[in-house]
Every structure is written in C-alpha cells, then in structure tokens.
C-alpha cells in the first residue's frame, strides 16, 4: 500500500469483553469522503473487508462480523458489539475519494479474571526437604490478557530464589479466548513457617487502569520433628480435692508423637500408665489426694523412631481430712464447763472455726472451744470448720451435739385450738431435755413420735373432737429420768361463718368442711396466737 511505511501508529481503542467498541474513522475531509468508506480487519497481516459505507449508508460483509457491526455518528463511527478476545486486532477505514487513504485503529480487549482460587498442599511440607516443595496452587480463571501473579508470605511478596523459592506459572486458553492462569508456589519452609499466611494476587489491566484481586490467606501444614515433650496441668495454681484436673502432654513437633502419661508408683518407683481420654488428656474428676504424685509423659515419634520423655511434674491435690471432734458426744450438767477440741490433717496449714449450728454465729477462731457455766440453752449443735485459707473452698466440717442434763422442757405451756365438733384433729406437742424425753397423751388417739435431734422430740396425735374432749381439753406429758412436764391444749368450738380473717384468737383451725369423722389437717393451716409461750 503506497505510503504505508510512514503511517502513524494506530489509534488505541480499549474495551472490556462483552461491551461495544466504537471505531471512529479518523480520516479528515481532505483525506477522503466519509460517505464512501471501506472497513477492514487485519489479522496476521491479512486484510478482510468487513463493512462498506456508501452515500452514508452502511452494509456488513458476510463473515464473523456480519451481525455485530453498525454505523453511528452520521457514518463516521463503526460500532462493534459483544466484543470478544478474538477481536483484539487492527481495524482500518479506507476512504475512496479523492484518493485512497486509510486510518488504523488498534482494538485492545480486556477482561478481569475471576477471584483467584488458592489451594494449599493438603499433604503438607517437611522442613528438611532438599528442594522446594509445593506449598499452594493459585488459579485465576477467565481473564484477558494473561494476568500477572504475585505470591505473598506474611504480606511480603516472594521472589524467585535458587533452591528456596520457585514459582511455576502456566496458562490455558479457553474456547472463549479467555485465559486461565495456574501458578504453583514451591518453597523450602522452616519450622517458623507453620503459622505463615500465604496468598496470591492477580494483577490485570482494564480500560480504567490497573487492578488487582487477592486470594484468601492460607497456612500450609509444616512437618518438623519433635525435640521436646512436656506436661501441662489445668487449672494452674493450687489444686484441691473435688476439682476437675486435666493433665495433657504437649510436644513441639508436627505431627505430635504418640503420647502416654504415667504416674510413678511411690512404693515400686515404677511408672504406671494412666488412662487418658480420646484426646490423650488425663482427666481427674473429682481429684483426690491419692492423685498427688510424680507424672511424666512419653512421646513415641514413630516417624523418626525417637522416644522423648518430659520433665517429671509433681502434682499436689490439696486436701483436708475428716474432721474429728473430742469429746464426740459430750454430756454436761447445768452450770458445768466443757472444752471441745477439733483436729484435722491437711496438705496445707489449717484454720479452725467454731460455729453455733442453729444460728451460724462464729464462737471461736481456733481448734479449741471452751464453754463455761453451761445453761440449758447451750445444748444443741456446734460445728467445727477446718479450712485452708490459701485455697478458697477447701474445707471440711464436723457437727457435735452438746447435751445438757435436765428434766423435760416444753415448747409451750398452754395453747388454745379452735375446732368443730366431729372433726379429726391433728395435735402436736414438742419437748426437749437430756436424756431425751418421751411424750404421752391423756386421751386415746393415734399418736406418733419423731426425734427432732438428740435432745428434742415431737409427738403428734390424731383425735376425734367429742363433747367430752371439748370439756376436758388435751394434755401431753413429757418425762425423762430427771422429771416430767405437761402442756395443755384447750379446745374451743368455732362457727366458720362468724370467724373473721384477722381474728387473733384462733390457734388451730381447719378450713376444710368438718363433717362427722372427716379428717382435717389442722397443722398445715394452723395460725398461732401471738401470746408468748411459756416453756415449762
């Protein structure tokens, strides 16, 4: 073509795959009449006529572009729709008059690759490999042109390094003309790379400029020999009986060796294997003082045929023994004195406290409690608490009952009970003393006795309310070797309709309908008089 050598560089038109390329014929009016133009595509230096413009009217030539070309901008621009990678070529327009001139356009096509897909080598890498081993593979699909790949380790780009880092990239052309890039990172890794984060980055161009896409970060399994095994105990700090204690074996190698945990038998000094759970953890629950001792872990690395032993670990499960109180069952006369002594063993220093059982009041800090000039009220429960102050929750207790000799002592002297005739009444009477009294009733009925504590007894009587009973009332008598005492229950008839809810004169009332021989549970609904009770 005359004058082709001195032709300027073609105009660059950049478009993304799938969009429309606007090819504007840049011939000036002096160079040619735009109403009479031929358009060619140039591929491998071969020109193919693809479109004709005559008197401003366009006509596609048969072939690959037939359906995708149209004229725009009053005939000066050729629009190519649905651009594909195969469209990346030179297009030229040639004016026919006054003389043949042409204008060249270089069409550049771009397509962003998909998100890079990274796959780590699932088999892992030994640290002492002689040459770089496959770490991960990065695949970037359907990009155009071929994107560039950069590999990163812990955020830093990796460069080719002889015998250390090798990046092997290859690409395939899809039927669409798009490229799929595959890049394999091979590297020699060290133990410190066990936590290293690797990712790949695809760099590509679009008409809008340079862009990049990053893969997710991955870590590769790194295998390195075990050099040390050790024991770890949880929880850390002071252990006590009842705790859940976990003893686990750990190693600095990957994969870890096969572990066994053993405890030294103090008498034979032999290591005896302890049964671990599926995770190789020895669980002591609840921990007992017998679990104290010397533990060690053996790791068998069958890959290198090396057995490794941990440093032994002394485990101390702190305890407090059963608490002993002497005297164990003290009996004293009123006015006398009593010394209670508390003893216990522990793996740590103990603190003792004496408390009154009924009130929880602290009476003494120390193992000895002295009681002088004993009154009847001093009888009852005393609790010794032996505790280890340095280990919260580690304590044992013992209750001792102090008995003061004396005749029966009644819970009340007199009581009024409101009743209905023919109802079955449930009456109760309580007495205390040492020796423990027994209770008898002055009327026939079903009586049952219940020991409340070593000095106290409760008797209940089921009796039918009769006119005679209303007249005489009911007496309960408590007696022991040292005497007897009586309580009286006065029975009074009540009219349910006249009874006011705030009446304070009733002492025992059944709200169930009282029909002949109906059993009424008077104890559950009993309302006590506010009057002070005399105590025999």
């Amino acid at each position: 073509v005359p004058g082709e050598a001195e032709q300027p560089a073609p105009e660059l038109v950049e478009v993304e795959v799938g969009s429309t390329a606007l090819l504007k014929c840049g011939l000036s009016q002096s160079q040619g009449n735009l109403s009479h133009v031929d358009w060619f595509s140039v591929h491998k230096e071969k020109r193919t006529l693809i479109f004709r413009v005559r008197q401003g009217q366009g006509q596609s030539e048969p072939g690959e572009y037939e359906q995708r070309l149209s004229l725009q901008d009053r005939g000066a621009t050729l629009a190519l729709t649905q651009v594909t990678p195969q469209d990346e070529r030179i297009f030229l327009c040639q004016g026919k008059r006054p003389r043949s001139q042409e204008y060249r356009i270089q069409l550049r096509v771009y397509k962003a690759p998909e998100e890079p897909n990274i796959q780590v080598n699932p088999l892992g890498i030994p640290v002492n490999s002689k040459e770089p081993e496959e770490v991960a593979t990065c695949v970037g699909r359907n990009g155009y042109p071929i994107p560039q790949v950069i590999w990163y380790k812990n955020g830093r780009p990796l460069k080719e390094e002889k015998n250390r880092v090798h990046i092997q990239s290859s690409q395939t052309v899809e039927s669409s003309g798009l490229y799929t890039l595959q890049s394999i990172l091979k590297a020699q890794l060290v133990k410190e790379d066990k936590d290293a984060q690797f990712y790949c980055e695809l760099n590509y161009r679009l008409p809008s400029g340079n862009h990049m896409k990053e893969s997710r970060e991955v870590t590769v399994p790194v295998f390195y020999p075990t050099e040390k095994v050790w024991l770890e105990v949880e929880p850390v700090g002071m252990l006590k009986e009842g705790d859940r204690v976990e003893i686990r074996c750990l190693a600095d190698g990957n994969p870890p060796p096969h572990f066994s945990i053993s405890k030294q038998n103090p008498s034979t000094r032999e290591a005896e294997e302890e049964t671990t759970n599926d995770n190789g953890v020895l669980v002591l629950e609840p921990a007992r003082k017998e679990h104290s001792g010397r533990y060690e872990c053996q790791g068998l690395d069958l890959d290198t045929m090396i057995s490794l032993l941990s440093e032994p670990q002394e485990l101390l499960v702190n305890y407090v023994s059963d608490v002993r109180v002497s005297p164990a069952a003290p009996e004293r006369q009123e006015g006398s004195s009593l010394t209670l002594t508390c003893e216990a063993e522990s793996s740590q220093d103990l603190e003792f406290q004496w408390l009154r059982e009924e009130t929880g009041q602290v009476l003494e800090r120390g193992p000895v409690l002295q009681l002088h000039d004993l009154k009847r009220e001093a009888g009852g429960g005393y609790r010794c608490v032996a505790s280890v102050p340095s280990i919260p929750g580690l304590n044992r207790t013992q209750l001792v009952n102090v008995a003061i000799f004396g005749p029966p002592w009644m819970a009340f002297k007199e009581r009024k009970v409101w009743v209905k005739e023919n109802m079955v009444l449930n009456l109760s009477c309580e007495a205390s003393g040492h020796p423990r009294p027994t209770i008898s009733w002055n009327v026939n009925g079903t009586a049952s006795e219940q020991d409340q504590d070593p000095q106290r007894v409760l008797s209940t009587l089921n009796v039918l309310v009769t006119p005679e009973l209303l007249e005489t009332g009911v007496e309960c008598t408590a007696s022991n070797d040292l005497g007897k005492n009586t309580s009286i229950l006065f029975l009074e008839l009540v009219n349910l309709t006249t009874l006011t809810p705030d009446s304070n004169t009733t002492t025992g009332l059944s709200t169930s309908t009282a029909s002949p021989h109906t059993r009424a549970n008077s104890t559950s609904t009993e309302r006590k008089l506010p009057e002070p009770e005399s105590r025999g």
């Epitope: 053993s262 053996q298 890959d303 290198t304 045929m305």
Partner: antibody, heavy 117, light 112 residues
C-alpha cells in the same frame, strides 16, 4: 543380604566439612529408619540422630544439632551425614545403623574421620 | 538425660563359665502403655562394628546364640552368657531408647 556400605576414612582440616555416605542394599530403603552413631577412640558410643528415608523427617541428639545434618537420596538408597565446622573433638569413627523396634539391627562398617591440620 | 551405668567395666572368665553383667538406668525404662522396657544390648568385637544381641530388654535378635539372655525391668538389667566361648571376647554395651538414645560405658569381657 542386608548391607550398609560406608565411605572410606577421611582426613580433614579444622573448620572444614565432611559428608559421609551410607549405601543400603538388601532391603527396602524407605521402610526403615537410619541412625547415626559416633565412637571416639577407645570410648563408648554416642547417638547423633535419626532420619526417616520415606518422609525425610529427622531427629537429633541436641548435642549434635547444628554439627550434623542428615539427608537421604531415595533414588540411590543412600543416607548422608554432613559434619561441619570440624574440630579435633570430632575425630572419631562414625557408624550408620538401620533401626528396628527402637534398636539398631544392622550397622555399617564405620567411617573414620580424622581432623588435623 | 537418662544415664546408663554398666558394671563391671571389665571382667575375665574362662571358656565355659557363666557370666553376668549389669546395666542400671537413672530412671525406669518401662513404657507403661506397651509394657516394654526400652533397652537393648550390643556386642562389639575388636576392630568391628557393634552387633545387636537383645532388644526390648529380653528379646533375642535372630541369629544370636541362645547362650545370650537379657533380663530385668525398670532400672535394673542383666546380660547373661550361660557358657562363654572364645569368640565372645568383646565389649558389651547396653543402650536405652526411652528418652532419645544413650549407651552405657560398656563392659569389656576377656577370656582367661
């Protein structure tokens, strides 16, 4: 017949390195661990380290870590031990041995290494 | 580290005699899960490489004459040669593999 054939005696200068080889025959090389042992003149035996020819994993006596490097070439059924920064203390006979049940059932004939200026 | 102590350091016996040599470890070599003692005995004849005689404290290696017997457990082990032969002249080493590998100092057996 199972054999472990080691290289001949070595005379090396202080500070230099030496690489001893141990060629295995008569059994599947990758099925057994290879161990290395040092015997100083008139002295007892000292374990240096082990290597698994199949996985390439190795383990060392901490005393020899950094002094000895164990490698294998599966294609030639050969185990290697490189000793570096040699001093007169490293003068000894070095043995390779095949591992079985945490014992050493076959031994090479030994390689004498003399470090002298 | 586990220390292996062998005694006596040397002994001289006549052919046909019974001989015992002792090996003590600074801690038990009995693996609690396998119930095996991680101890082996080796024989090293003058100018030769060591040879495995006994492993797991009492298992005789194939091809080893039955006059060689290993016994013991935990920390105390014994190698017994029931009737010493002239070819038994050697240094005998015990070795533990319970925690890495360590050899004893050896017992030198001489024939009178």
């Amino acid at each position: 017949e199972i054999q472990l054939q080691q290289t001949g005696p070595e005379l090396v200068k202080p500070g230099a390195s030496v690489k001893i080889s141990c060629k295995a025959s008569g059994y599947s090389f990758t099925d057994y661990i290879m161990l290395w042992v040092k015997q100083s003149h008139g002295k007892s035996l000292e374990w240096i380290g082990n290597i698994n020819p199949y996985s390439g994993s190795s383990g060392y006596n901490l005393k020899f870590k950094g002094k000895a490097t164990l490698t294998v070439d599966k294609s030639s059924s050969t185990a290697y031990m490189q000793l570096n920064s040699l001093t007169s203390e490293d003068s000894a006979v070095y043995y390779c041995a095949r591992g079985k049940d945490f014992a050493m059932d076959y031994w090479g004939q030994g390689t004498s290494v003399t470090v002298s200026s | 580290d586990i220390v292996m102590s062998q005694s006596p350091s040397s002994l001289a016996v006549s052919a046909g005699e019974k001989v015992t040599m002792s090996c003590k470890s600074s801690q038990s070599l009995l693996n609690s899960s396998t119930r095996k003692n991680f101890l082996a005995w080796y024989q090293q004849k003058p100018g030769q490489s060591p040879k495995l005689l006994i492993y797991w404290a009492s298992t005789r290696e194939s091809g080893v004459p039955d006059r060689f017997t290993g016994s013991g457990s935990g920390t105390d082990f014994t190698l017994t040669i029931s009737s010493v032969q002239a070819e038994d002249l050697a240094v005998y080493y015990c070795k533990q593999s319970y925690n890495r590998y360590t050899f004893g100092g050896g017992t030198k057996l001489e024939i009178k």
